[in-house]
Interface confidence: low
Amino acid sequence: SGVFQLQLQEFINERGVLASGRPCEPGCRTFFRVCLKHFQAVVSPGPCTFGTVSTPVLGTNSFAVRDDSSGGGRNPLQLPFNFTWPGTFSLIIEAWHAPGDDLRPEALPPDALISKIAIQGSLAVGQNWLLDEQTSTLTRLRYSYRVICSDNYYGDNCSRLCKKRNDHFGHYVCQPDGNLSCLPGWTGEYCQQPICLSGCHEQNGYCSKPAECLCRPGWQGRLCNECIPHNGCRHGTCSTPWQCTCDEGWGGLFCDQDLNYCTHHSPCKNGATCSNSGQRSYTCTCRPGYTGVDCELELSECDSNPCRNGGSCKDQEDGYHCLCPPGYYGLHCEHSTLSCADSPCFNGGSCRERNQGANYACECPPNFTGSNCEKKVDRCTSNPCANGGQCLNRGPSRMCRCRPGFTGTYCELHVSDCARNPCAHGGTCHDLENGLMCTCPAGFSGRRCEVRTSIDACASSPCFNRATCYTDLSTDTFVCNCPYGFVGSRCEFPVGLPPSFPW
């Protein structure tokens, strides 16, 4: 269904004559008759199979025709059709002189014809006007035409019916070709399927209206991408529903057993280092100057032997005091009152006098240090070994003894603890800074997933239609997570098919 539209623009009849050559009196009061029919190689008289239309008198002799011209006529002229547009046509436009007001064919003299044009050809459906100009000996007609589809009809031939809708049967408008264009938030062949909230998990979430995200059993969160852990799980997480994978430092089926007392309770005082040594037990390594189980007791400051060169330490209320041996002075007896005459430099050190011989300085050979070159150089004082490696002096050089999991000259390289596949029963291994951690599959626990914790209720594959099975550890039963289109405790029932459509 569509409309052939003809827009008359300008008619020129400068001499104001009829087709016979006879002049109009007083001028040619011009109206038009239009005949639209099927394609004919030679346009001949006969029925106007696609329709006819006439105009009122539009002007005299030569005139321009305005859009929606006055006098009751319409410009463009409309020739509606109720069939598939064939793509070809024949068009006859006759210009007639109306001596009076009666424009009926039988009321006009036979020689009232001013001009007649006939064209035929191909014409595709479209919004663009085709411009044309037809000239005869005495007249010229300028016009344009096009074919457009009626409301709700689309496609190259106006044969596709499409009505926009926004209800249970679909949510769409129609594209120029008649295909459906879904309204925002809808998808699917008939735009019946809502588009869920952006990011809503494809398998674990669903929606019944746009921008919604409803979670399937075992899942939670705005986007249904957070699993629900085992009921009663205290300090654990899950990667699939009903799991309870313990956080670091926690153990047991419900991750409620504290394996990391140090982190959770910080029992060591005064900057001491805490080490876990079993469930709810720990050891504090105190900093110098402190003692006690939790390093809560302050030691005498003299216990750290602050006085050098054989000086003796005495406690004071707010610190300590060094008593220096003969030839030394200073807060820690670090300065000498000897001179080079006393040969104070040991281990081959050379003596240099200072302050006119009042004191001296020793220049030490390699591998010796101290104000009197009395100390052998300890190459480990700078603590060059990384990752807790132990530094060992070996003659003129040094070496690092590395902790398990580290290698390299300075223990700077991390050896993957996971390389030897330590996790049993398909557990997933994670390298940590201080070792490794196993994430166990459902039904297993322990540091290496070596402990079977429950019967695997999913082992018998009880779920139908490719549903995902999860074991509920608290009851040793299973839960089936159904794919889209299926319901039931085992996903055995298909959801009813969508109703058929009325077009």
């Epitope: 623009q9 663009n128 006007w129 411009l131 100009e133």
Partner: antibody, heavy 122, light 108 residues
Framework: QVQLVQSGAEVKKPGASVKVSCKAS????????MHWVRQAPGQGLEWMGI????????SYAQKFQGRVTMTRDTSTSTVYMELSSLRSEDTAVYYC???????????????WGQGTLVTVSS | EIVLTQSPATLSLSPGERATLSCRAS??????LAWYQQKPGQAPRLLIY???NRATGIPARFSGSGSGTDFTLTISSLEPEDFAVYYC??????????FGQGTKVEIK
């Protein structure tokens, strides 16, 4: 938006020909007639002719009949105006102008090219 | 062909004054007449079509009147940017489309 972009200035000798182009964009090229209008230095506007880009049909002012040729290339949405047997009085700015066919201002010129100066000098 | 005659050839006015330009046709053009403004180095700009209709984006100070053979373009209060050459053009009888010879509005 509608744009008409013309070719650059030309200097020609008497007796030669010149071909000026006008590239259209921003609308359906074949739906609007195109006109050429020229303006000699310090003078008024002079209509030269019209071309129907849809079929290529033309109509020229009597004054230029036989000397002017208007053509179009629908693949590039471009119209051309060629003027031959140039004389010094053809020195002018040549404009293409789109007829406002699909609006109420039919057969007036709402959109113009920027103009092309053609100088005819020996 | 229809000849359009514009008067005066030059109009010397000050900003804020009212400008009245005339265009006379050698025969009736009904109301099929337009007015254009042209500034040096620029293409003409359509101001008024069909004798009295303002084109898109044209300020209200520009108005057109007349029918048949006598037409007037009025600029109610001249702005500095209105000093230019103004042409009338008919589309009643064509070809050719014809223009008037122009009226120059200059600053007094």
């Amino acid at each position: 938006q509608v744009q008409l972009v013309q070719s650059g200035a030309e200097v020609k000798k008497p007796g030669a020909s010149v071909k000026v182009s006008c590239k259209a964009s921003g609308y359906t090229f074949t739906s609007y007639y195109m006109h050429w209008v020229r303006q000699a230095p310090g003078q008024g506007l002079e209509w030269m002719g019209i071309i129907n880009p849809s079929g290529g049909s033309t109509s020229y002012a009597q004054k230029f009949q036989g000397r002017v040729t208007m053509t179009r290339d629908t693949s590039t949405s471009t119209v051309y105006m060629e003027l031959s047997s140039l004389r010094s009085e053809d020195t002018a700015v040549y404009y293409c102008a789109r007829e406002e066919y699909a609006s109420s201002s039919a057969e007036y010129f709402q959109h113009w090219g920027q103009g092309t100066l053609v100088t005819v000098s020996s | 062909e229809i000849v359009l005659t514009q008067s005066p050839a030059t109009l010397s006015l000050s900003p804020g004054e009212r400008a009245t330009l005339s265009c006379r046709a050698s025969q009736s053009v009904s109301s099929y007449l337009a007015w254009y403004q042209q500034k040096p180095g620029q293409a003409p700009r359509l101001l008024i079509y069909d004798a009295s209709n303002r084109a898109t984006g044209i300020p209200a100070r520009f108005s057109g009147s007349g029918s048949g053979t006598d037409f007037t373009l009025t600029i109610s209060s001249l702005e500095p940017e209105d000093f230019a050459v103004y042409y009338c053009q008919q589309r009643s009888n064509w070809p050719p489309w014809t223009f008037g010879q122009g009226t120059k509005v200059e600053i007094k």
